[in-house]
Interface confidence: low
């Protein structure tokens, strides 16, 4: 007999089904019985927390407390909500081991040395923008660096191209308009191959292929780490060189950082259906 | 600019209730952020108790959560801490503070803070 | 809960030396650290968020850094008035929590 409702984990949700709730009454329709703002269903004798977010495509990225990033916090909360584990969003913008390198995704992102602003005329500034009083004219101001994202052509809503999804949020915060990814690579000629994997995700084959042989001859150097670096690599496998005292990580596709601790946004994965683009 | 003040009783009984009031001028309470109370006890240790955010709703500190609420009243500008059954481990410096910015929980605004002792 | 752990109570040091103070995660916590100093009979100020970032008006003597599990708060040229209580905190997940302090005295 399962003890909570993440016993009764599958993919889609949490189902319970042949539990004789008149004894066990963790299995009825309560308050309580799905957390993070899961969506309790009573079928028959059949409970089932089901996570169905109607979140929108703002590329807002945060940071959560698993090391995660998100397209935004509703992404985040939907997370949460899967795994039912609590998920806080601990910075705005992607995660960087670099806090301080200054995305422009929060109000003091970057060197912190912004003031923050109070009043309301700050909330006309959106897509990311920040609000500066100070200027005589302009109160929005975009500072967003997009000097350090990969190269990764895509085809927004305002029919432009952009060398990456970076450029398309700082072209939306200087227009102050909603740009949004319409497709992986560029505008009518797309020169960007794509692949379908078996979870049913685009994603990069040149990328691919090239993680493939780092993988192949990564594996010939290493050896597995001992068992007291479980929990070293947040999305991959630890490894241990003859030749390097500390371990290192070989991550996962999508994830990159010293521990994978990184979504890597120049893989774009995207989940297909009518102009409907995530970032998982 | 913002600022917070705490005020309530300095001497509470063992059992009753301790109720606190942080008064926060430079800023409406429901424009944003999240409103902490946070206390230290002698011997200078820090404990985060709990917050209010702008929308009303409520974090507590899972060791508290029996004893705790933290409410609000907009029209004054004002958070309120509610601790019932205390005893005289409740003895601490009582602060109110405002989180950073949303998506950070560090606190940049604090009360002066305002000692309660809990004694018969 | 989240431990954080200061490891010394007590630091000795010389206006004008650098000194660090360390803090430690009982668990990762990405970069979701805040440091703050406490002055006697005052009420803590933020001097660094998100594990490296200045607050406002805070001067660039002070420095954080780390990420996951241990981080640092480096003083360089230290004046007389940073003579105070250092503390740690983690928002990554409730409850927050504070390290036990770091008291910074002179030799």
């Known amino acids: 007999f399962p003890t909570s409702l993440s016993d009764c984990q599958t993919p889609t949700g949490w189902n319970c089904s042949g539990y004789d709730d008149r004894e066990n009454d963790l299995f009825l329709c309560d308050t309580n019985t799905c957390k993070f703002d899961g969506e309790c269903l009573r079928i028959g004798d059949t409970v089932t927390c089901v996570c169905q977010f109607k979140c929108n495509n703002d590329y807002v990225p945060v940071c959560g407390s698993n090391g995660e990033s998100y397209q935004n916090e509703c992404y985040l909360r939907q997370a949460a909500c899967k795994q039912q584990s609590e998920i806080l969003v601990v910075s705005e913008g992607s995660c960087a081991t670099d806090a301080g390198s200054g995305s422009g995704d929060g109000v003091h992102e970057g060197s912190g040395e912004t003031s923050q602003k109070e009043t309301s005329t700050c909330d006309i500034c959106q897509f990311g923008a920040e609000c500066d009083e100070d200027a005589e004219d302009v109160w929005c101001v975009c500072n967003i660096d997009c000097s350090q994202t990969n190269f990764n052509p895509l085809c927004a809503s305002d029919g432009k191209s952009y060398d990456n999804a970076c450029q398309i949020k700082e072209a939306s915060c200087q227009k102050q308009e909603k740009i949004e990814v319409m497709s992986l690579g560029r505008c009518q000629d797309n020169t960007t191959t794509t692949t379908k994997s078996e979870d049913g995700h685009y994603a990069r084959t040149d990328y691919a292929e090239n993680a493939n042989k780092l993988e192949e001859s990564a594996r010939e150097h290493h050896i597995p780490c001992p068992e007291h670096y479980n929990g070293f690599c947040m999305h991959g496998k630890c490894e241990h060189s003859i030749n390097m005292q500390e371990p290192s990580c070989r991550c996962d596709a999508g994830y990159t950082g010293q521990h994978c601790e990184k979504k890597d946004y120049s893989v774009l994965y995207v989940v297909p259906g009518p102009v409907r683009f995530q970032y998982v | 600019d913002v600022q917070l003040q705490e005020s309530g009783p300095g001497l509470v009984k063992p059992s009753q209730s301790l109720s606190l009031t942080c008064s926060v001028t430079?800023?409406?309470?429901?424009?944003?952020?999240?409103w902490s109370w946070i206390r230290q006890f002698p011997g200078n240790k820090l404990e985060w108790m709990g917050f209010?955010?702008?929308?009303?709703?409520?974090k507590y500190n899972p060791s508290l959560k029996n004893r705790i609420s933290i409410t609000r009243d907009t029209s004054e500008n004002q958070f309120f801490l509610n601790l019932r059954s205390v005893t005289t481990e409740d003895t601490a410096t009582y602060y109110c503070?405002?989180?950073?910015?949303?998506?950070?929980?560090?606190?940049?605004?604090w009360g002066q803070g305002t000692s309660v002792t809990v004694s018969s | 809960d989240i431990v954080m752990t200061q490891s010394q109570k007590f630091m000795s040091t010389s206006v004008g030396d650098s000194v660090s103070i360390t803090c430690k995660a009982s668990?990762?916590?990405?970069?979701?650290v805040a440091w703050y100093r406490q002055k006697p009979g005052q009420s803590p100020k933020l001097l660094i968020y998100?594990?490296?970032n200045r607050h406002t008006g805070v001067p660039d003597r002070f420095t954080g850094s780390g990420s996951g599990t241990d981080f640092t708060l480096t003083i360089n040229n230290m004046q007389s008035e940073d003579l105070a209580d250092y503390f740690c905190?983690?928002?990554?997940?409730?409850?927050?929590?504070f390290g036990g302090g770091t008291k910074l005295e002179i030799k």
């Open positions: 209010i955010s702008y929308d009303g709703s409520n």
């Open positions: 430079g800023y409406s309470i429901t424009s944003g952020y999240y």
């Open positions: 998100s594990a490296s």
């Open positions: 668990q990762n916590v990405v970069t979701a």
């Open positions: 905190q983690q928002y990554s997940s409730y409850p927050f929590t």
């Open positions: 503070a405002r989180g950073l910015r949303r998506g950070d929980y560090s606190m940049d605004y």
